[in-house]
Interface confidence: low
């Protein structure tokens, strides 16, 4: 999906109002310096691409993020503010429902959510121009 035509300010508002807090709740009990940020992004569409991938694509050691509160709110924000996004997700969502597993918060998931926090931060802070 090409995130170029999303309403970035509305997505930013959704992040500020709820998603950020859900991410913090998920990470509660974890030190902010425990994980190094290894994933970054260069502009808002790129950040959303990385956020979408880390939030909804199962990875080795962490297959359960898509049912978390922050993930559902992320999905809702993208569906509302990114034209055509929801249509691209119908098949993926149906497949996900079939393989829903017991929720387990692994260290790998915590690391992945830490990366997500970094990506959202970068999304909210387009880099200052170098002068």
């Amino acid at each position: 999906y090409d995130f170029t035509n999303c309403d970035f300010e509305k997505i930013k508002a959704a992040y500020l109002s709820t998603i950020s807090k859900d991410l913090i709740t998920y990470m509660s009990g974890t030190k902010s310096t425990e994980f190094n940020n290894t994933v970054s992004c260069s502009n808002r569409p790129h950040c959303l691409t990385e956020i979408q991938s880390l939030t909804f694509n199962p990875t080795a050691g962490c297959a359960s993020l898509a049912k978390e509160m922050f993930a559902m709110k992320t999905k809702a924000a993208l569906a509302i503010w990114c034209p055509g996004y929801s249509e691209t997700q119908i098949n993926a969502t149906q497949a996900m429902k079939k393989r829903r597993k017991r929720k387990v918060t692994t260290n790998k998931c915590l690391e992945q959510v830490s990366q997500l926090q970094g990506l959202w931060r970068r999304f909210n802070r387009p880099l200052l121009k170098q002068q």
Epitope: S20, N36, R121, L128, Q130, Q131
Partner: antibody
Framework: EVQLVQSGAEVKKPGASVKVSCKAS????????MNWVKQAPGQRLEWIGI????????SYNQKFKGRATLTVDKSASTAYMELSSLRSEDTAVYYC??????????????WGQGTTVTVSS | EIVLTQSPATLSLSPGERATLSCRAS?????MHWYQQKPGQAPRPWIY???NLASGVPARFSGSGSGTSYTLTISRLEPEDFAVYYC????????FGGGTKVEIK
């Protein structure tokens, strides 16, 4: 624990330059912006500018543009503020302040202890 | 540049009284932050994003407002509350208000 430790007090002559440092610890230095704020004796807080340690990008208060230069040394997790062509009205306490974007509105959530700069002939 | 005007400049009250501090912006801003500063100390974040109390701030403090008008309220002043309070916006660069000094009457 997040800590910002600033360099010591400076006494400078008019026309000279001063470079204040701010050593950050307890968080990933490149994740957050660093602000610099001036407070003249008995006066309000005055924003000087902001720098992104991630890429060195800067934005300045027009009042300080051209005289203030913000830089970082990523390897040392240290931010710097250099002020040139000093005059008596630059006598003030200068603070570095981390800007955290986990809070709505990106607040300055941790401050250095302040560096007193005195400009006197 | 967005100019923030705080009023009153000085508020003389007794412990136990209610304090209402105002911050007006020259144009609309999304949120307002408040900082507390005591003599010889660096400012401390006090209220984030209009109404969220910073860690360790007592519940007698509250913040409200929107657009160009924001308020910090202390429901019942305690001795440790006497200080200078600054508002700050970030919608357009960053600017601070002139501060309100809350002093003991």
């Amino acid at each position: 624990e997040v800590q910002l430790v600033q360099s010591g007090a400076e006494v400078k002559k008019p026309g000279a330059s001063v470079k204040v440092s701010c050593k950050a610890s307890g968080y990933t230095f490149t994740d957050d912006y660093m602000n610099w704020v001036k407070q003249a004796p008995g006066q309000r807080l005055e924003w000087i500018g902001i720098i992104s340690p991630y890429n060195g990008g800067t934005s300045y208060n027009q009042k300080f543009k051209g005289r203030a230069t913000l830089t970082v040394d990523k390897s040392a997790s240290t931010a710097y503020m250099e002020l040139s062509s000093l005059r008596s009205e630059d006598t003030a306490v200068y603070y570095c302040a981390r800007e955290d974007y986990d809070y709505d509105g990106y607040a300055m959530d941790h401050w250095g202890q302040g560096t007193t700069v005195t400009v006197s002939s | 540049e967005i100019v923030l005007t705080q009023s009153p400049a000085t508020l003389s009250l007794s412990p136990g009284e209610r304090a209402t501090l105002s911050c007006r912006a020259s144009s609309s801003v999304s949120y307002m932050h408040w900082y507390q500063q005591k003599p010889g100390q660096a400012p401390r974040p006090w209220i984030y994003a209009t109404s969220n109390l910073a860690s360790g701030v007592p519940a007698r403090f509250s913040g409200s407002g929107s657009g160009t008008s924001y308020t910090l309220t202390i429901s019942r002043l305690e001795p440790e509350d006497f200080a200078v309070y600054y508002c700050q916006q970030w919608s357009s660069n960053r600017t601070f208000g002139g501060g309100t000094k809350v002093e003991i009457k």
